[in-house]
């Protein structure tokens, strides 16, 4: 989080920012920034693999849910969107694109349909779906 | 929008940021920043007047919808939340807290209940509601 004095090199002037306020990012242009993570919701429907490729082309990954507190904006997301969670048939676990295992109690996984990919739904639910099904998707970029 | 070079005065070092990336804000701590506007969704239910007072106490106002393009993150908001739109009985118009009139085609106004205040719902819908009814609310702060 950036401190209260910034150099605006565009105008070469110092700007005072109240200490209760802060800048968020950096993020790709026109992405949502929240608690120093960057998010973008994509309207076009793609299958999971195409969605993953779209995020990667923007130096991002599909949504990773790692904290209900830090990501509480996800509570209010309407509809269903691909996230970066996939089923590993060999050991039956669910893991994120980066290889980490889904932490217990983060998502309620609803595994009623056949599939190896997961859609994020509001209130931290994950619906298992066929990876080839077109859906909208959420990309995420974690800032350092 | 801040240019690609920032002074991190906390560590007194320059940080290179790709030109395609930018910082957003400044915003109150832990608010959502999008296209240089700040948003916060409040879980507690308050009537319209209490919601307005809560936003004002944080140097913000209730949500103002002024652009579908600049505020397209609002498309995907789940549930219904007070925004800063009120009915002026004298001339029958809908206006924002700042006195500006609701632009045509920005919101689909749905008069489900008798009332003079409006709830924001996903996909740019406004539901008319009695101002005394408790609801969650969205505060917004526009950055300069």
């Amino acid at each position: 989080i950036w401190s209260a004095v910034f150099l605006n090199s565009l105008f070469n002037q110092e700007v005072q920012i109240p200490l209760t306020e802060s800048y968020c990012g950096p993020c790709p242009k026109n992405w949502i920034c929240y608690k120093n993570n960057c998010y973008q919701f994509f309207d076009e429907s793609k299958n999971w693999y195409e969605s993953q490729a779209s995020c990667m082309s923007q130096n991002a990954s599909l949504l990773k849910v790692y904290s209900k507190e830090d990501q509480d904006l996800l509570k209010l997301v309407k509809s269903y969107h691909w996230m970066g969670l996939v089923h590993i048939p060999t050991n039956g676990s669910w893991q994120w694109e980066d290889g980490s295992i889904l932490s217990p109690n983060l998502l309620t996984i609803i595994e009623m349909q056949k599939g190896d990919c997961a859609l994020y739904a509001s209130s931290f639910k994950g619906y298992i779906e066929n990876c080839s099904t077109p859906n909208t998707y959420i990309c995420m970029q974690r800032t350092v | 929008i801040w240019s690609a070079v920032f002074l991190n005065s906390l560590f007194n070092q320059e940080v290179q940021i790709p030109l395609t990336e930018s910082y957003c804000g400044p915003c109150p701590k832990n608010w959502i920043c999008y296209k240089n506007n700040c948003y916060q969704f409040f879980d507690e239910s308050k009537n319209w007047y209490e919601s307005q007072a809560s936003c004002m106490s944080q140097n913000a106002s209730l949500l103002k919808v002024y652009s579908k393009e600049d505020q397209d993150l609002l498309k995907l908001v789940k549930s219904y939340h007070w925004m800063g739109l009120v009915h002026i009985p004298t001339n029958g118009s809908w206006q924002w807290e700042d006195g500006s009139i609701l632009s045509p085609n920005l919101l689909t106004i749905i008069e489900m209940q008798k009332g003079d205040c409006a709830l924001y719902a996903s996909s740019f819908k406004g539901y008319i509601e009695n101002c005394s009814t408790p609801n969650t609310y969205i505060c917004m702060q526009r950055t300069v």
Partner: antibody, heavy 118, light 110 residues
Framework: QVQLVESGGGVVQPGRSLRLSCAAS????????MHWVRQAPGKGLEWVAV????????YYADSVKGRFTISRDNSKNTLYLQMNSLRAEDTAVYYC???????????WGQGTLVTVSS | QSVLTQPPSVSEAPRQRVTISCSGS????????VNWYQQLPGKAPKLLIY???LLPSGVSDRFSGSKSGTSASLAISGLQSEDEADYYC???????????FGGGTKLTVL
């Protein structure tokens, strides 16, 4: 096109058993959760049970728990409802349905009438 | 007694607008998508609204859905005689781990 055809309904005495079947065609049956929903004469819809795509997860309405069993045979594209210890209040048209978990696709059969009467 | 509460009947004149309410709890409507079904006499139900307010393809835009908190509503504008039917709300219930339906509302077009 998608078809769901229920069979096995009829008149049965209280305390007896009945098995309903639902033959599915026109979609990949083995990929989808399937439901039974019933409607008593002149009354509203009541959800009865759901089974996951592979039969590993089954959930029931409280009113039928312990008496009804939902099952499926994916090799035959068929859904079943085994109804034991039938009561007069189980009298209804029973619909087999694919309800939407995600999205807007739902399919219903035409229903089969079960009458429990002595 | 249905888990979701609907008025048993509503009536309105042709070309008018009518609203049907559906009240539930945080474990169903409050936390999950609401679907609305239309059932014509002697027919199976037909999906009218999904995910609170979305229209399946082929459904007239005279139908609209909304949701606030633990209540949902179905509105029908420009009423026509062919809209006479029973209407049901439905949602998944996290506590019961099952679908729950409203008791149904009979719409009469006067």
């Amino acid at each position: 096109q998608v078809q769901l055809v229920e069979s096995g309904g009829g008149v049965v005495q209280p305390g007896r058993s009945l098995r309903l079947s639902c033959a599915a065609s026109g979609f990949t049956f083995s990929s989808y959760a399937m439901h039974w929903v019933r409607q008593a004469p002149g009354k509203g819809l009541e959800w009865v049970a759901v089974i996951s795509y592979d039969g590993s997860n089954k959930y029931y309405a409280d009113s039928v728990k312990g008496r009804f069993t939902i099952s499926r045979d994916n090799s035959k594209n068929t859904l079943y409802l085994q109804m034991n210890s039938l009561r007069a209040e189980d009298t209804a048209v029973y619909y087999c349905a694919r309800l939407p978990w995600v999205g807007s696709v739902d399919y219903w059969g035409q229903g089969t009438l079960v009458t429990v009467s002595s | 007694q249905s888990v979701l509460t609907q008025p048993p009947s509503v009536s309105e004149a042709p070309r008018q607008r009518v609203t049907i309410s559906c009240s539930g709890s945080s474990s169903n409507i409050g936390n999950n998508a609401v679907n609305w079904y239309q059932q014509l006499p002697g027919k199976a139900p037909k999906l009218l609204i999904y995910y609170d307010d979305l229209l399946p393809s082929g459904v007239s835009d005279r139908f609209s859905g909304s949701k606030s908190g633990t209540s949902a509503s179905l509105a029908i504008s420009g009423l026509q005689s062919e809209d006479e039917a029973d209407y049901y709300c439905a949602a998944w219930d996290d506590s019961l781990f099952g679908w729950v339906f409203g008791g149904g509302t009979k719409l009469t077009v006067l």
